[in-house]
């Protein structure tokens, strides 16, 4: 909020606190203030000031303790490399402005690792990775000198150590000391030097957090006791057997504030959703804290592995619960976690040493009572027998992630608490809660989950194809006959599922255009595979001009699709992916999926339509209960079907029916929607249950969707459960895991 001269509840006057070129906002009910500068600028000499008991604001002091009269917004610079070993960088300058570039070159005999070119970003950090010139001779690779740090130690033999330092006024994040370990890995994590104005961008946090959260072990599973050198792509193994506990620890103190607390809850709900999407069921512990901790969910509770139930508990937590005791006692909160980890009578249960523990702490990093929480982390490490046995240090069994939110974050405190692991980041500092929410939205979409079906990026910044990443546009160019438009759905890296009636037997592959992800370019087609039972002229003799039974086709692409945020598959029924998406047990049968997705009632579903170049979701109800018969009977109103005596001649068991006005007035499909998916949206995932085939009424004459449509305007869709043998046969090499 922009500053106002209303006197804060504290006793400090706002006179003379203005900042040149920026504004300020009050925090902690006027006990602190934060200077806010435009993008690309930072507050000099400090970002925050506190109201002292004497009634004056803390002094404006520079890093070398000189007093400044007035705060000002200064342009952000990126630090220069203090040292660069075995090579040169250019251009050399005492400081670099935003968007300046530097490039690195190695001397002969040395090879460059990391980024050869780096750009100074708006947050004062360099893009890319640390550039390192290495001759490959050391037992460990050269660990490099992250820009802004200084390194002591230049030998990389087994058990050699290097130490890092920051210039005065900067805080070291990561490991100050790293040791060359067996197998050629370095202990700890790469350091960096942080200025108080530096924040991690949501994208940086999402990438770093998730690459750590989901890194999978290639090689021996950690429970086979792998040694310190066997760092083969560490993970938190999201172990499908469920031997994993995740402790969510949420700061509810005064300094966090109510809106931030609500935002943090949203983030954790997204995290639970994310982890559930992997088809694993960790146990959750849930703690909020201020002066005292409050345990809302214990890992020992029967429902602690039920993601929906845990989410419900989380949503019911109120910021006001800590209002009367609103200090920040992080130590006590972590002791609550310790108490959940430890076992009664000190007798470890069977399998205790195979359970992985993940602590996710969201805080402003300002513990002001109870003592140093790092001592509890040490106790937890002791309890889990971590770091005690050199041959099997068990570091994989504990991960502590700390998310520091806001300007008051104490970087030293949060860095001390977080785990430090090679090539991973466990400590994050974000500007505000909106940024942290961004992180968790982006996280739901990281690359590890790109192959997961039916996942979308529901973020406010998402485009149409972020929200419908499976949607494919199909057009068939027929010389002298114009062109036919249809929709389809990406079901695997090589196949798009659509309607057979979009094509004729004369259509050549080169005349069929398919585009996905909103991209302009068309994809090359190898072949169109029709369902063998589809025959549009199959009942002409019986006076039925067009017969749409088995109206499904698969378009096989020449080249593999590259999944990304705007291109990814929808879930198909009776696949392992759908079992996981619906969070059903791995033993779930096809019939059980059918009961879950298509129960005998009105089923809320959706289809995607293009209106004025925009994709929009249309909510409809599949009539699968008592309204099914009347829905199907309305097919007689379709052009050419008025003479049909028995409607089951045209509406075979292969069809699902939507449309009409009960229970709600359903929107109808248009011609161009044919072939698109009919979708059931469950547990934040999208499962295709049908393919749009035909409609009773053309509600889209003259390119405009009519508002008023008759009650008999129904749409018919091929039920995918009825064409599974064909899907299974044609998609057998696509790794979809049909049940």
């Amino acid at each position: 909020t922009p500053w106002s001269l209303a006197r804060p509840q504290g006793s400090c006057s706002l006179e003379g606190v203005e900042i040149k070129g920026g504004s300020f906002r009050l925090l902690q009910e006027g006990q602190a203030l934060e200077y806010v500068c435009p993008s690309g600028f930072y507050p000099y000499p400090v970002q925050t000031r506190t109201c002292r008991s004497t009634g004056s604001w803390s002094t404006l002091k520079t890093q070398d303790q000189k007093t400044v009269r007035k705060a000002e917004c200064r342009a952000i610079h990126c630090p220069r490399p203090h040292d660069f070993e075995n090579g040169e960088y250019w251009p050399r300058s005492p400081y670099y402005n935003v968007s300046d570039e530097i490039s690195f070159h190695c001397y002969d005999g040395y090879t460059l690792r990391g980024s050869a070119n780096r750009t100074c970003q708006v947050n004062g950090r360099w893009s890319g990775q640390t550039a390192i010139c290495d001759n490959g001779a050391g037992y460990c690779s050269n660990p490099g000198i992250p820009i802004g740090t200084r390194k002591v130690g230049s030998q990389y033999r087994l058990e050699d150590s290097v130490t890092y330092h920051c210039s005065r006024g900067l805080t070291l994040r990561g490991s100050q000391r790293r040791t060359c370990q067996e197998g050629g890995s370095w202990s700890g994590t790469e350091p960096s030097c942080q200025d108080s104005f530096m924040y991690d961008t949501p994208q940086e946090v999402a990438e770093a957090f998730l690459s750590s959260l989901t890194e999978t072990i290639e090689g021996v599973d950690a429970e086979d006791g792998h040694g310190p050198g066997e760092q083969q792509k560490r993970k938190i193994v999201l172990d499908p057997s469920g031997s994993m506990n995740i402790y969510l620890v949420l700061d509810g103190s005064d300094s966090i504030g109510a809106s931030n607390f609500t935002g943090a809850k949203k983030c954790l709900v997204n995290l639970i959703e994310k982890v559930a999407s992997y088809g694993v069921k960790p146990r959750y512990g849930l703690v909020t804290y201020a002066t005292y901790p409050k345990i809302w969910v214990k890992v020992s509770e029967a429902d602690s592995s039920n993601a929906d139930w845990v989410t419900k508990q989380l949503n019911e937590i109120n910021y006001e619960d800590h209002k009367l005791k609103s200090g920040t006692n992080t130590k006590k909160a972590l002791q609550a976690v310790y108490s959940m980890m430890s076992w009664p009578d000190d007798v470890p249960p069977e399998g205790w040493n195979r359970t992985r523990h993940v602590i996710i702490l969201m805080t402003d990093g300002l513990h002001n009572m109870g003592g140093d929480p790092i001592t509890v982390i040490d106790e937890i490490r002791d309890l889990l027998y971590i770091g005690k046995d050199r041959k099997n240090p068990r570091e994989d069994y504990l991960d502590v992630y700390v998310f520091g939110v806001g300007p008051l974050v104490n970087q030293v405190n949060i860095n001390a608490l977080a785990s430090k692991k090679d090539n991973e980041q466990h400590v994050f500092k974000v500007k505000d809660m909106e940024n942290l929410e961004d992180v968790f939205y982006q996280m739901i979409d990281e690359s590890q989950s790109l192959s997961l079906c039916g996942m979308v990026w529901e973020h406010r910044k998402g485009t149409d194809y972020h929200k419908q990443p499976w949607q494919a546009k199909i057009s068939v160019i027929r010389p002298s006959k114009g062109h036919e438009s249809c929709m389809g759905a990406v079901v695997s890296e090589y196949f798009v599922l659509t309607a057979a009636h979009c094509f004729t037997v004369d259509d050549k592959e080169h005349s069929i255009k398919v585009s996905v992800g909103g991209e302009k370019r068309d994809l090359e087609i190898e072949v169109v595979l029709f369902h063998p039972n589809y025959n549009i002229n199959g009942k002409k003799e019986a006076g039925i001009p067009e017969f749409y039974d088995y109206d499904v086709a698969l378009i096989k692409l020449k080249n593999k699709l590259k999944y990304g945020q705007t291109i990814r598959p929808i879930c198909l029924p009776c696949t392992e992916g759908t079992t996981r998406a619906l969070r059903l047990p791995p033993t779930t049968t096809c019939q059980q999926q059918k009961e879950e997705l298509l129960p005998a009632q009105d089923i809320k579903a959706l289809f995607v339509s293009e209106e004025e170049k925009k994709l929009t979701r249309k909510e409809v109800y599949i009539k699968n209960g008592d309204k099914k018969g009347s829905c199907e009977r309305d097919a007689q109103y379709a052009p050419g079907y008025d003479k049909v005596k028995d409607i089951s001649e045209v509406v075979t068991p292969r069809f699902l029916c939507t449309g009409g006005v009960s229970p709600y007035a359903d929107p109808n499909t248009c011609r161009g929607d044919s072939g698109g998916p009919l979708i059931v949206h469950k547990r934040s995932r999208f499962i295709q249950v049908g393919v749009i085939s035909w409609g009773v009424v053309d509600v889209c004459k003259n390119q405009k969707r009519q508002k008023q449509v008759p009650a008999h305007a129904r749409d018919f869709h091929i039920n995918l459960f009825q064409v599974l043998p064909w899907l299974k046969e044609k998609l057998q090499d696509e790794d979809l895991g049909f049940l």
Epitope: Y139, R157, E159, E182, G184, S185
Partner: antibody
Framework: QVQLVQSGAEVKKPGASVKVSCKAS????????MTWVRQAPGQGLEWMGW????????KYAQKFQGRVTMTRDTSISTAYMELSRLRSDDTAVYYC?????????????WGQGTLVTVSS | DIVMTQSPDSLAVSLGERATINCKSS????????????LAWYQQKPGQPPKLLIY???TRESGVPDRFSGSGSGTDFTLTISSLQAEDVAVYYC?????????FGQGTKLEIK
Amino acid sequence: QVQLVQSGAEVKKPGASVKVSCKASGYSFTDYYMTWVRQAPGQGLEWMGWINPNSGGTKYAQKFQGRVTMTRDTSISTAYMELSRLRSDDTAVYYCARGYYANSAWFAYWGQGTLVTVSS
Amino acid sequence: DIVMTQSPDSLAVSLGERATINCKSSQSVLNSRNKKNYLAWYQQKPGQPPKLLIYWASTRESGVPDRFSGSGSGTDFTLTISSLQAEDVAVYYCKQVYNLPWTFGQGTKLEIK
């Protein structure tokens, strides 16, 4: 040029100790780890451990822990390996070896070997 | 401990012919980050200390003739002598330095047929 010269052959009784020396020349002694490897008659090679002559820090193979002591005297550029509580299966040729400056794991230079015979 | 197993135990090859010695480790000695295999080959002639031939599984030590080459990755490695010379008669050892204790193979004795 780099040279590692070891002390002469020894005959010891079971339960006794032996101390083998390795004198280095032709390079800066404290810059390189010194490793000890042994080879029983007609058998393969066995890594025993190393010493960092600069700090005096040692790393021993678990098998020899408690029986082996590696020391150095930087003033005369000499490394020592002492093995106590000798048994007959300790009869072997004991080698000192030096790695590279950057990587102590590749044994580029070796002493000529010292035969230690343990016999009652 | 990582166990190194060489095959064959002994090998007789005619002069000028190719000799191949295999080495298998009980677990991978490849560092997946720096893509290096922590493996070396040594040659030992009777009455002499061993001599370093190959390190990083395929890098030839300076002064070693180019008829010697190393290959393989992960758990399976090969030392090849492309054209056997009389002076190559020796015992050859592979060694892993991925985990402590560093361990050697049992050796392969190479003779002339």
